[in-house]
Interface confidence: medium
């Protein structure tokens, strides 16, 4: 099949380069973080960020890999097993369960390539798909058919 | 900061252009869809994906841009403006709002790149952030101070 | 052998909704979008939207004004397209179509379904 | 929408003929352009993918070419059995859309 032509470099610039340099911005989720105070507890906050506000709480927790591009992946943990009642805000509702949304990501890993007579010449990119948690959401436990 | 060396060139291909073969492959969320007998309804099924049987229920909505890497990115969309009551599934409680999950996704745009004296030189790429919306959750409303 | 296996012929009156299934074999049903695409008698093909069975994932043709639901089945490899307030200008063939891919190049409708006839009168 | 306008709208022409189908977009559309043939009463099949590249199991005697807003789809032999309507269709926008049409006869 065909396919785009190759990439341009700019005045000498190895643009695989340039992709990597550009890549390895961490983009964390869109909203910043405000201070909670109970960040590690089991409960929906009526301040701060969604993650802290959502009656299924989830952290985020930072997977950081030199080798890999992105660098910085982030990871959904949800505080608690249930989701909190929304009439306190801390109690837990058993009709409800804590379950975490997955996606998978493509990432490209760095690998020593190697030259026609088996040198190492520089580093190559492999594709890969990387499972990360996205965030954490109540849902209904499902009923056994 | 420091960044990776060029990436290596297998053969002659220029590993940006491997980087955009690569990189073409959609990649849905991870949990295949099952029957969702009311696709666009407000109500929290008790089979199916996690989109469905979620109290803050969404869709996904197809965004294709061939200029674009990834070509194919999914929107959520949800389906109800407040949560949907754990207990019933399907009435909604006015003390949830159902809220959109955003990120900002590291996307590419191919476009014209120019030689030296302006004449077109294939495709470069560009990068840019991109907002997609993950997921609906459900969360307490902010309480204004 | 892929093979994308439709619904019988259907009869409706106007103001009625009608259901057509399209059953897949032959390949791994959720690697693939599902099209679905109209042919009015003596009319040009009329796409009318897809779905990413993985996710459940659709894209619609605006001009179907929401009266189109696609669906999927993926445990029977099944989709489903539903067309509601049917009026007369709606009576053709309704084809499933599976859209195949390569990297930046091409989306195709590289197997189609036998169609259905759906006659609003 | 992306209009999408074929022409002739019909044709006729004798086996052995070179024959030559144009389709024209309203807007810039890159290659991103696919034919396809419906034989009469019969399912439409894909017959050339991103302009140019023919489908599997496709005779060699078709072939595609253009960029932009003008397309070809060219028949450099006529055979009997390439009797049909034949479609043009982009893929650069949703909603896809197809051209009318062009209905090849023999003569």
């Known amino acids: 099949y065909s396919h785009w032509p190759s990439c341009c470099p700019s005045k000498g610039q190895d643009t695989s380069e340039e992709l990597l340099r550009w890549s390895t911005v961490p983009v964390p989720p869109l909203e910043p973080a405000r201070p909670n105070r109970h960040p590690e507890s089991c409960r929906a906050s009526e301040d701060g960020p969604l993650n802290s506000r959502a009656i299924s709480p989830w952290r985020y927790e930072l997977d950081r890999d030199l080798n890999r591009l992105p660098q910085d992946l982030y990871h959904a943990r949800c505080l608690c097993p249930h989701c909190v009642s929304l009439q306190t805000g801390s109690h837990m509702d058993p009709r409800g369960n804590s379950e975490l949304l997955y996606h998978n990501q493509t990432v490209f890993y760095r690998r020593p390539c190697h030259g026609e007579k088996g040198t190492h010449k520089g580093y190559c990119l492999e594709r890969r798909l990387y499972r990360v948690s996205l965030a954490c959401v109540c849902v209904r436990p499902r009923v056994m058919g | 900061y420091s960044h990776w060396p060029s990436c290596c060139p297998s053969k002659g291909q220029d590993t940006s252009e491997e980087l955009l073969r690569w990189s073409t492959v959609p990649v849905p969320p991870l949990e295949p869809a099952r029957p969702n007998r009311h696709p666009e309804s407000c109500r929290a099924s008790e089979d199916g994906p996690l989109n469905s049987r979620a109290i803050s229920p969404w869709r996904y909505e197809l965004d294709r841009d061939l200029n674009r890497l990834p070509q194919d990115l999914y929107h959520a969309r949800c389906l109800c403006p407040h949560c949907v009551s754990l207990q019933t599934g399907s009435h909604m409680d006015p003390r949830g709002n159902s809220e959109l999950l955003y990120h900002n996704q590291t996307v590419f745009y191919r476009r014209p790149c120019h030689g030296e004296k302006g004449t077109h030189k294939g495709y470069c790429l560009e990068r840019r952030l991109y907002r997609v919306s993950l997921a609906c959750v459900c969360v307490r409303p902010r309480v204004m101070g | 052998e892929v093979q994308l296996v439709e619904s019988g012929a259907e009869v409706k009156k106007p103001g009625a909704s009608v259901k057509v299934s399209c059953k897949a074999s032959g390949y791994s049903f959720s690697g693939y979008t599902m099209n679905w695409v109209r042919q009015a008698p003596g009319q040009r093909l009329e796409w009318m939207g897809l779905?990413?069975?993985?996710?459940?994932?659709?894209s619609y043709n605006q001009n179907f004004k929401g009266r189109v639901t696609l669906t999927v089945d993926t445990s029977a490899s099944t989709a489903y397209l539903e067309l509601n307030s049917l009026r007369s200008e709606d009576t053709g063939v309704y084809y499933c179509a599976r859209e195949d891919f390569d990297s930046w190049t091409y989306f195709a409708m590289d197997y189609w379904g036998q169609g259905t006839l759906v006659t609003v009168s | 929408d992306i209009q999408m306008t074929q022409s002739p709208s019909s044709l006729s022409a004798s086996v052995g003929d070179r024959v030559t189908i144009t389709c024209s977009a309203s807007q810039g559309i890159s290659n991103y352009l696919n034919w396809y043939q419906q034989k009469p009463g019969k399912v439409p099949k894909l017959l050339i993918y991103?302009?140019?590249s023919l489908h599997s199991g496709v005779p060699s005697r078709f072939s595609g070419s253009g960029s932009g807003t003008d397309f070809t789809l060219t028949i450099s032999s006529l055979q009997p059995e390439d009797v049909a309507t034949y479609y043009c269709?982009?893929?650069?926008?949703?909603?896809?859309?197809f051209g009318q049409g062009t209905k090849l006869e023999i003569k």
């Open positions: 991103y302009t140019s």
């Open positions: 269709q982009q893929y650069l926008a949703f909603p896809y859309t």
């Open positions: 779905i990413n069975p993985y996710n459940g994932g659709t």
